[in-house]
């Protein structure tokens, strides 16, 4: 008796839904009375499906109302675990343990990404020095580097600072500021840079005509 996995690594987005799968051999019709399926992560019990019954009493609180076994898939030899509203804490190694005549298990690794998509920006000016402070703030995971460039996409020199804090959902709240001497209509870009492809997000900041503090904008691309 052998359990197999179509994929042993899933990279999923924070807040999305995921379905991870383990396959087991079923000849002709599924005998529910002989089937036991456990899904667990470390020692957290996610699914306990024994002889056709799911026992929610033993389900770990962090998965309550979010995890379910797709029972219509069992007859196809597919023990599929669906988790909705994926959290950062859902990252880790999952195990499907299946007993159906024989017993076997397989491991599945889940990684959770939260792209720094929504970049909030602010521009303020010091009237005394005409120095502008450009600020970009976004939430995501894991750590991102913030890169400042000019309209030619060249690195900008200037005094910069970065602060990082945690949100309630354990995302990283990253705020980067850059102090530069600039004139009206100069264009700057802040890029939240991550090493994985497709994980970079950039906001465009345009120095306004009037030396005033502007409300947050959400212009990103």
């Amino acid at each position: 008796f052998t359990v197999t996995v179509p994929k042993d690594l899933y990279v999923v987005e924070y807040g999305s839904n995921m379905t991870i799968e383990c396959k087991f051999p079923v000849e002709k019709q599924l005998d529910l009375a002989a089937l036991i399926v456990y899904w667990e992560m470390e020692d957290k019990n996610i699914i306990q499906f024994v002889h056709g019954e799911e026992d929610l009493k033993v389900q770990h609180s962090s998965y309550r109302q979010r995890a379910r076994l797709l029972k219509d898939q069992l007859s196809l030899g597919n023990a599929a675990l669906q988790i909705t509203d994926v959290k950062l804490q859902d990252a880790g190694v999952y195990r499907c343990m299946i007993s159906y005549g024989g017993a076997d298990y397989k491991r599945i690794t889940v990684k959770v990404n939260a792209p720094y998509r929504k970049i909030n920006q602010r521009i303020s000016v010091d009237p005394a020095t005409s120095e502008h402070e450009l600020i970009c703030q976004a939430e995501g995971y894991p750590e991102a580097e913030v890169i400042w460039t000019n309209s030619d996409h060249q690195p900008v020199s200037g005094k910069r600072s970065v602060t990082t804090s945690r949100t309630e959902g354990m995302l990283l709240n990253v705020t980067s500021s850059l102090r530069v001497n600039a004139t009206a209509n100069d264009v700057f870009y802040c890029t939240f840079w991550r090493s994985q492809p497709g994980q970079n997000h950039t906001a465009e900041l345009i120095i306004p005509e009037l030396p005033a503090t502007h409300p947050p904008q959400n212009r990103t691309h």
Partner: antibody, heavy 119, light 107 residues
Framework: DVQLQESGPDLVKPSQTLSLTCTVT?????????WHWIRQFPGNKLEWMGY???????NYNPSLKSRISITRDTSKNQFFLQLSSVTTEDTATFYC????????????WGQGTLVTVSA | DIVLAQSPATLSVTPGDSVSLSCRAS??????LHWYQQKSHESPRLLIK???QSISGIPSRFSGSGSGTDFTLSINSVETEDFGMYFC?????????FGSGTRLEIK
């Protein structure tokens, strides 16, 4: 901290059944993980024998399948090994162990107990 | 069953030397290979999991590499406490199996 301790007879006669107990402290055997029996023969060769999952599902080494049984007593936080029809070839140090948090490897081991099969 | 062949059977070294221990699988096991150290009259202790992942509390002089069928445990500058037996273990398929071991001894 998780601790495991094997206990049982030092000497078993050929054709008899070898019975060992693993007593676990610091963690409930029903809370999670697989709980294994592993033996080490004179000469150091290690052999995985089988496990009992926290749900009581078992899986055994096919080379022992007809002779081995792993059971448990949750009230005492113990799990047991029974190996029937032993021969002198079954003389070994027997270890109980618990897998690691991401499975597949053995994180916690008992100190081992030597069982000699001899007439 | 997957057979793990360890070599050499015995390695005689002087403290301060750096050494490499080999474990070769009879078929591909991806990275499902773990290394243990066993000192005389003690239980095995995990050193490296999944071929190269370090373990909390294990000195950084121990490192692992390899994938597929060929794996190496490296000890950078052996210390006297490192002498003993070293075993590899595969978890790719049942039954889990161990290598026959490499004895690291003082020259």
């Amino acid at each position: 901290d998780v601790q495991l301790q094997e206990s049982g007879p030092d000497l078993v006669k050929p054709s008899q059944t070898l019975s060992l107990t693993c007593t676990v402290t610091g963690y409930s055997i029903t809370s999670g993980y697989n709980w294994h029996w592993i033996r080490q023969f004179p000469g150091n060769k290690l052999e995985w024998m089988g496990y009992i999952h926290h749900s009581s599902i078992t899986n055994y080494n096919p080379s022992l399948k007809s002779r081995i049984s792993i059971t448990r007593d949750t009230s005492k936080n113990q799990f047991f090994l029974q190996l029937s029809s032993v021969t002198t070839e079954d003389t070994a140090t027997f270890y109980c162990a618990r897998e690691g948090y991401d499975y597949d490897w053995f994180a916690y081991w008992g100190q081992g107990t030597l069982v000699t099969v001899s007439a | 069953d997957i057979v793990l062949a360890q070599s050499p059977a015995t390695l005689s070294v002087t403290p301060g030397d750096s050494v490499s221990l080999s474990c070769r699988a009879s078929q591909s096991i991806s990275n499902n290979l773990h290394w243990y150290q066993q000192k005389s009259h003690e239980s095995p202790r995990l050193l490296i999991k999944y071929a190269s992942q370090s373990i909390s509390g294990i000195p950084s002089r121990f490192s692992g590499s390899g994938s597929g069928t060929d794996f190496t445990l490296s000890i950078n500058s052996v210390e006297t406490e490192d002498f003993g037996m070293y075993f590899c273990q595969q978890s790719k398929s049942w039954p889990f199996t161990f290598g026959s071991g490499t004895r690291l001894e003082i020259k």
